[in-house]
Each structure stands twice: as structure tokens, then as C-alpha cells.
């Protein structure tokens, strides 16, 4: 969705912290296969 | 996984009271958490919200006289004070979804018993 | 400020009927909207998210739509297990906020 309404601050940290997640889950994947492939 | 509230009482007017919220299958580094309220025969109101790194949001009319806060790893506490008549409700504790990139939209998904409290002179 | 209105506040079906609920926000909040389900002396229940998605282990009689400001519960199929009060929530903001929820509708099976 857009950010209009969404400035809330309870969602700009949703917004944060679901960031944050979702890299921590892209990173650990990228990082696992590199092992795997060592 | 479960919530439950604890502490609600009869009180008096201006009376200080603190309720307790525990958790048990879940750890509250992992979720945020909420208290919402229902006077009898009304609807639910919302009180406020503790996330995972204790930074607290309230309803307009909390005004500060209601403070959420975490005690230990399980529990969340409720401190209510300057109570009146019109506090009187049931009080729930409720878990928050997850936060996802395409949806950090908040929902109540956990949902405790709830704990009675009656302020009356 | 940021208000849901509910509509109607009560209204009966029969069993077997359908069941429609509207739900009003006051500004856009997209798809960030939830609905749950209350009997009495129990806690509310989530029945749906995200306007559309159902929670785990929700029927699909109970079906959400809409976006923007404008939501809809229908309950197909209505038994006497759905005689309840169902709410609606805006999730899109929490903070300093009146209430995010709607005002309920009680819906009673006959």
C-alpha cells in the first residue's frame, strides 16, 4: 500500500522492524548458500 | 500459546490499580503487545501498545493516566490511575501480529480472558 | 482523526441466510483491515485481515472485502454458532489515535 496514511509512528516502526526482517531472512539465505556452495 | 490478565479488582475512585498480563508459549523480545478494554454491554476501545523494545503508544484519552510497561520477559503490566466510574470495563490483553514488508499493519490476533475491574464508591 | 463507523448495529438472519456488514473508515487506510468475532463472556476473535485473508482455522462462510474506505463482512450460510457481535479494525495507525475500532453489530441468528 502507499505510505499516505501511514505515517503514523507505530507504523513507520512496523514498517522498520518488517525491513529489517525481511533482510535479516534474504542475508541468512544468501549466506547459507555461499556455504553450502563452498 | 496463551495470555492472560490478572489483578482486577473493586475499587474506589482514585484509587491506583496495575494489572498483569502474562504470556506463556511465546517470549515478548519476539512480540508486541496490547491492552484493550470493554465496558459492560459497549464495544472495545483500545488503551495502548508496548512493542518488543518497550517504546510505548497510547489512545488520545489515555492522557497519561494509564502506563504500560514490561516487568519481566513474560509479563506486562497495566498501571491505571485517577481511576472513575467510567474506567469500569473488563480489561483484555491481546498479542500483535507480525510486521511484514508488504503488511506492517497491526492486528490482535492473541486474545486473553480478560480481568474485571469495577470502580464504584 | 481517524474514525471507523459500523453499520447496521444489530441485525437478525435467519439460519441458512446471509449476513452483511459494513464497515466506514474515515480516511483511506487501503487494505489494513481486520474483523473479529465476539460471544458473550469470551474474548474477540480474529476472523479476518489484511480486508480479505482469513485467520487460521476461520470458516469460509465468513468472507471480507474491500479497500480504501469502504469494507464489507458477509457471513453466508448463517448458523446458530455465528449469533455473536462482530467488529472491524483500521491497523494503520495506533498512535495518539481515538479508537480503532468499530463500533460492533450484533448479529442474532433466528
Known amino acids: 500500500h502507499s505510505d499516505g496514511i501511514f505515517t503514523d509512528s507505530y507504523s513507520r516502526y512496523r514498517k522498520q522492524m518488517a525491513v529489517k526482517k525481511y533482510l535479516a531472512a534474504v542475508l541468512g539465505k544468501r549466506y547459507k548458500q555461499r556455504v553450502k556452495n563452498k | 500459546q496463551s495470555v492472560e490478565e490478572s489483578g482486577g479488582r473493586l475499587v474506589t475512585p482514585g484509587t491506583p490499580l496495575t494489572l498483569t498480563c502474562t504470556v506463556s508459549?511465546?517470549?515478548?523480545?519476539?512480540?508486541?503487545m496490547s491492552w484493550v478494554r470493554q465496558a459492560p454491554g459497549k464495544g472495545l476501545e483500545y488503551i495502548g501498545i508496548i512493542n518488543t523494545n518497550d517504546d510505548t503508544w497510547y489512545a488520545s484519552w489515555v492522557k497519561g493516566r494509564f502506563t504500560i510497561s514490561k516487568t519481566s520477559s513474560t509479563t506486562v503490566d497495566l498501571k491505571m490511575t485517577s481511576l472513575t466510574t467510567e474506567d469500569t470495563a473488563t480489561y483484555f490483553c491481546?498479542?500483535?501480529?507480525?510486521?511484514?514488508?508488504?503488511?506492517?499493519?497491526?492486528?490482535?490476533?492473541?486474545w486473553g480472558q480478560g480481568t474485571l475491574v469495577t470502580v464504584s464508591s | 482523526a481517524l474514525v471507523m463507523t459500523q453499520t447496521p448495529s444489530s441485525v437478525s438472519a435467519a439460519v441458512g441466510g446471509t449476513v452483511t456488514i459494513n464497515c466506514l473508515a474515515s480516511q483511506n487506510i487501503y487494505n489494513s483491515l481486520a474483523w473479529y468475532q465476539q460471544k458473550p463472556g469470551q474474548p474477540p476473535k480474529l476472523l479476518i485481515y489484511r480486508a480479505s485473508t482469513l485467520a487460521s482455522g476461520v470458516s469460509s462462510r465468513f468472507k471480507g472485502s474491500g479497500s480504501g474506505t469502504q469494507f464489507t463482512l458477509t457471513i453466508s450460510g448463517v448458523e446458530c454458532a455465528d449469533a455473536a457481535t462482530y467488529y472491524c479494525?483500521?491497523?494503520?495507525?495506533?498512535?495518539?489515535?481515538?479508537?480503532?475500532f468499530g463500533g460492533g453489530t450484533e448479529v442474532v441468528v433466528k
Open positions: 479494525q483500521q491497523g494503520a495507525g495506533a498512535d495518539n489515535i481515538g479508537n480503532p
Open positions: 508459549g511465546f517470549s515478548l523480545s519476539s512480540y508486541d
Open positions: 491481546a498479542r500483535i501480529s507480525d510486521a511484514y514488508v508488504f503488511d506492517y499493519a497491526y492486528y490482535f490476533t492473541l
